[in-house]
């Protein structure tokens, strides 16, 4: 849930959590399922060509509170959502790219920043 442009991390569980992983599967994952002491996440961001790319996976408890806050980064269109309420809960997360700000529009193929 977002308030004032930020999302807060849900409460971690007292047991291991299994998450779907896509483009972000660690070595210890099995059949696109990873495990964590922290959160499941789904993230959408623009690649270098401006195409939206969705990744999902596990975030460890250490530092994940900050990562799940989704603090806006200048010149980067990215959105992340986190969950812990059940295993593979990130299957049901559908973050959307934040809208383009005026200064991010470009007139032609040359990207001025």
């Amino acid at each position: 849930k977002k308030e004032d442009g930020e999302s807060t991390a849900p409460t971690p569980r007292p047991k291991i959590l299994r998450c779907k992983c896509h483009h972000h599967c660690p070595e210890d994952s099995v059949n696109n399922i990873c495990s964590t002491d922290g959160y499941c996440f789904t993230m959408i961001e623009e690649d270098d060509s401006g195409m939206p790319v969705v990744t999902s996976g596990c975030l460890g408890l250490e530092g994940s509170d900050f990562q799940c806050r989704d603090t806006p980064i200048p010149h980067q269109r990215r959105s992340i959502e986190c969950c812990t309420e059940r295993n593979e809960c990130n299957k049901d997360l559908h973050p959307t790219l934040p809208p383009l700000k005026n200064r991010d529009f470009v007139d032609g193929p040359i990207h001025h920043k």
């Epitope: 569980r13 007292p14 047991k15 291991i16 299994r18 660690p26 070595e27 210890d28 994952s29 099995v30 990873c34 495990s35 964590t36 002491d37 922290g38 596990c58 460890g60 408890l61 250490e62 059940r86 295993n87 593979e88």
Partner: antibody
Framework: QVQLQQPGAEVVKPGASVKLSCKAS????????MQWVKQRPGQGLEWIGE????????MYNQKFKGKATLIVDTSSSTAYMQLSSLTSEDSAVYFC?????????WGQGTTLTVSS | DVVMTQTPLSLPVSLGDQASISCRSS???????????LHWYLQKPGQSPNLLIY???NRFSGVPDRFSGSGSGTDFTLKISRVEAEDLGVYFC?????????FGSGTKLEIK
């Protein structure tokens, strides 16, 4: 205190199925996974799989897929493991065990004997 | 599957001696979260296993401080500083980093 109660023994015929039970008490049942482990004399311990009672999510050892089915009844804080198409190879002690990030409490185990 | 190799298979000791059991894994047990999920259990005859050490070096509640665990990556050790009669039984290492979770074959601690 944490307790996992299992029946001491079960005797079943080859080809039949059996449903082993594990009644949990002394903690919040949905806060931990429940694992099942097989022990045969001289064969060590084998992890069968686990179930999260809060959402009934299961993970299985590939070796036991099709052989074992894990279920829970949260109203009675009881975990069950159904074993099907039993053969003499299934004769063993079966433990249930509470798992958060590691197994901290085990049931006393049910000795399953498959015999005609 | 991750293979857990325990040595020795049998460890004859005199009461009061130090005992050391080794456990090696076929893959690193460092989880992607940074935790190492390697644990030690003691199983006495006719009983279920009891947790001694979790996550390499943490003693479980009620476990005497003569038990200690150490190691990293693929190489782990359980030490008992002064063996007492109640310590006799089979010791297992176990990993919960990789699915399927696996166990060592056990080390039988017995009186010399």
């Amino acid at each position: 205190q944490v307790q996992l109660q299992q029946p001491g023994a079960e005797v079943v015929k080859p080809g039949a199925s059996v449903k082993l039970s594990c009644k949990a008490s002394g903690y919040t049942f949905t806060n931990y996974w429940m694992q099942w482990v097989k022990q045969r004399p001289g064969q060590g311990l084998e992890w069968i799989g686990e179930i999260d009672p809060s959402d009934r999510y299961t993970m299985y050892n590939q070796k036991f897929k099709g052989k074992a089915t894990l279920i829970v009844d949260t109203s009675s804080s009881t975990a069950y493991m159904q074993l099907s198409s039993l053969t003499s190879e299934d004769s063993a002690v079966y433990f249930c065990a509470r798992f958060g990030y590691y197994v901290d409490y085990w049931g006393q185990g049910t000795t399953l004997t498959v015999s005609s | 599957d991750v293979v857990m190799t325990q040595t020795p298979l049998s460890l004859p000791v005199s009461l009061g001696d130090q005992a050391s059991i080794s456990c090696r894994s076929s893959q690193s047990l460092v989880h992607s979260t940074g935790n190492t999920y390697l644990h030690w259990y003691l199983q006495k005859p006719g009983q279920s296993p009891n947790l001694l050490i979790y996550k390499v070096s943490n003693r479980f509640s009620g476990v005497p401080d003569r038990f200690s665990g150490s190691g990293s990556g693929t190489d782990f050790t359980l030490k008992i500083s002064r063996v007492e009669a109640e310590d006799l039984g089979v010791y297992f290492c176990s990993q919960s980093t990789h699915v399927p979770f696996t166990f060592g074959s056990g080390t039988k601690l017995e009186i010399k």
